[in-house]
Interface confidence: low
Amino acid sequence: ASVGLPGDSLHPPKLSTQKDILTILANTTLQITCRGQRDLDWLWPNTPRDSEERVLVTECGDSIFCKTLTVPRVVGNDTGAYKCFYRDTDVSSIVYVYVQDHRSPFIASVSDEHGIVYITENKNKTVVIPCRGSISNLNVSLCARYPEKRFVPDGNRISWDSEKGFTIPSYMISYAGMVFCEAKINDETYQSIMYIVLVVGYRIYDVVLSPPHEIELSAGEKLVLNCTARTELNVGLDFSWQFPSSKHQHKKIVNRDVKSLPGTVAKMFLSTLTIDSVTKSDQGEYTCTAYSGLMTKKNKTFVRVHTKPFIAFGSGMKSLVEATVGSQVRIPVKYLSYPAPDIKWYRNGRPIESNYTMIVGDELTIMEVSERDAGNYTVILTNPISMEKQSHMVSLVVNVPPQIGEKALISPMDSYQYGTMQTLTCTVYANPPLHHIQWYWQLEEACSYRPSQTNPYTCKEWRHVKDFQGGNKIEVTKNQYALIEGKNKTVSTLVIQAAYVSALYKCEAINKAGRGERVISFHVIRGPEITVQPATQPTERESMSLLCTADRNTFENLTWYKLGSQATSVHMGESLTPVCKNLDALWKLNGTVFSNSTNDILIVAFQNASLQDQGNYVCSAQDKKTKKRHCLVKQLVILERMAPMITGNLENQTTTIGETIEVVCPTSGNPTPLITWFKDNETLVEDSGIVLKDGNRNLTIRRVRKEDGGLYTCQACNVLGCARAETLFIIEGVQEKTNLE
């Protein structure tokens, strides 16, 4: 067989035998002559090997380009391909020689010394056991052990070829530890050498590049890319890299196996690509490919090389952020930078540190924003290499949905006397200011009452106050604006001209941040009246009484109840006035009945009122004729005892003789403190020139004289103690002599 490159003017050398296959007997001499057009060489089976001196290659003598190959006393192992070729070319002629040796029909090649067959468990893969034969038409079977199994050629996927060996699907022998070929000649059995079976994996689970995604560097920096492949066990792996720059001299690739963690069924391989000093030409896509012989997996990353470090804010940075109070605010920092900048946040010029309410970093997060958090926030980015700084200011506006002041109080449940004029108010704080405050109303019987709920009243429909058909005549006064507790608040007032109908009134306030509402129960009754004695606001530990007065001719069975937590057992869905229908659920109080000519008065006395006595008290009276119960509710608020305090400063005063001095002693305390004034530690007594007003809070000295100068002390005392404040009066000028003659 001649082998040559097409179009080549060189003709393949000619062999003395015309056959492609030559069969000779063992112990005979093999001689083949080769003639050609230029220098020739021979290659024979199992070269190079120790017995090389057995093979003779000699010049022919009759021609320059002629060589004869002689092998005396051939043996079975000399079976194989004999090739004559032109030096330094691929042009050749080959003859396959079978040396028929019935004593050793299998050829042992040099590589067979290892006797290892590598297989994969892939169903589609076949493996060749290289038990080649010195006889072309042998009946060969394959023996595998342990357990012992024999495989014979089936004319399909199992076959034997004297030039190649025994071919079999690899999965069939993957269980075996060793295999060998066996041939039968004239009832004699011949075996090839033993081949150890090694199952080789091929699966690559994944290929991971680190760092992943995009890598940013500036020129001159070192690039290190790690490519880690995870494979099944018994895998051999090759890595290859693709990269943008064709200059390879500054790139270094190191491949190594990584020790697998104990107990894992995966093997790790690592290939590291290093460029000590990157240039712009190194920018681009880097691909790492892992190949296991049967499987390829790759991963890629992009390397961006900047000519120098830089820093700038991204276009998406906001200058104004609006948030609703209580919400979470996130102000992200959008920047373009290499390397990543140091980020520092400042609020109104002061640095912010992370705490449980604020988290600073790539974005500023305020967990639950409050109005206090409003202000100017500045973020300063610093490039850690160039130290270049960039700053950006964000104004945070915190919007507050309308908050209705009265809502914070216990919902007033007072009943209103028939025919009286009443005023309902809603005090609203909102930021930004309100779009509007609207009032709505609905008849009491059109709504349902569920006391256990935060919002106990449910009205299917609310009517605008302009539509007062069937209700009380209403007027909404112009909104007032007041500075309360340091906040600008809106006070909306609803005036009920005459209370004839029991209704619910709702004020609804809306601004851009949201809405707030307050529902006011307006229960109108003709009948009993509740009064508190004394009329002043009671303070704890004081004595006070609740009086329920009812016309003796109309009402009977006056009873006091306290609307305590037991009231939650009021049946669901009852209309308003449920208190009367569920008196059993209330806490009955012992009262004392007094009578005068027209009324019965039921008194509940509190000898030593405590904060626990606060709450809603119900007076129940039964109509003598109809037997219908009427209930009246009074909200009792008891002030906590407080020691006296002087709540402001008493300024020293300088005045001229004959002028008027006025000074106020600002006090607080419960019970209301008793105020006494002293001059130079002597109790001050009212006379024609000294006037004390407003419970001695105001001291006025008219037509001051020189002797009115001195140290004045204001003392406020109640049962819990006293508080004092001093002021100095300096009187200037000369006292005129008075002529009394």
Partner: antibody
Framework: EVQLLESGGGLVQPGGSLRLSCAAS????????MGWVRQAPGKGLEWVSS????????SYADSVKGRFTISRDNSKNTLYLQMNSLRAEDTAVYYC????????WGQGTLVTVSS | DIQMTQSPGTLSLSPGEGATLSCRAS???????FGWYQQKPGQAPRLLIY???SRATGIPDRFSGSGSGTDFTLTISRLEPEDSAVYYC?????????FGGGTKVEIK
Amino acid sequence: EVQLLESGGGLVQPGGSLRLSCAASGFTFSWYVMGWVRQAPGKGLEWVSSIYPQGGATSYADSVKGRFTISRDNSKNTLYLQMNSLRAEDTAVYYCARGNYFDYWGQGTLVTVSS
Amino acid sequence: DIQMTQSPGTLSLSPGEGATLSCRASQSVSSNYFGWYQQKPGQAPRLLIYGASSRATGIPDRFSGSGSGTDFTLTISRLEPEDSAVYYCQQFDSLPLTFGGGTKVEIK
């Protein structure tokens, strides 16, 4: 980002019923008045109904009073419109809108009443 | 019920020109409870102006509102091609809430 997504529209015979839903996200649903506004093919906008956030107070246009019921589930951030005794003149795109000022609207759902 | 009447029905103008849209209420409406909306074909309406004169979030300053009592005006100072739409006015001073019939603005 405030989003309102209506669903439940479709073809229904006169006298039939439908329930529209509006799923809200991106804002505190329980703070806002919510409403339904409809638009008949080629016509202008018509307010249908509004509901208040907590108390569940409602108001309706005369044309739907007694037939339509607005409701809301603040825990699910969802607004509903139950439409009964539907008439041919109720055919329209129904929009869900936020607030007393309808500052955000859904994309609408088409209700066709036809035999 | 408060009727809202818009005029003109259609307005055809060139880009860069100014547009004035009118809305009249059948009875006095508090300016606090008056708004303007824009609706483009196949889209939901969008709030432009609330409280008669306050611009809604994200609305360009070429849109402005004015008026009180029964007469309200929407002004578009410099028309852009994207302003081609139907504009509706609305009151919610009293129930039922009512919209105007709309003014169609066409850009030549």
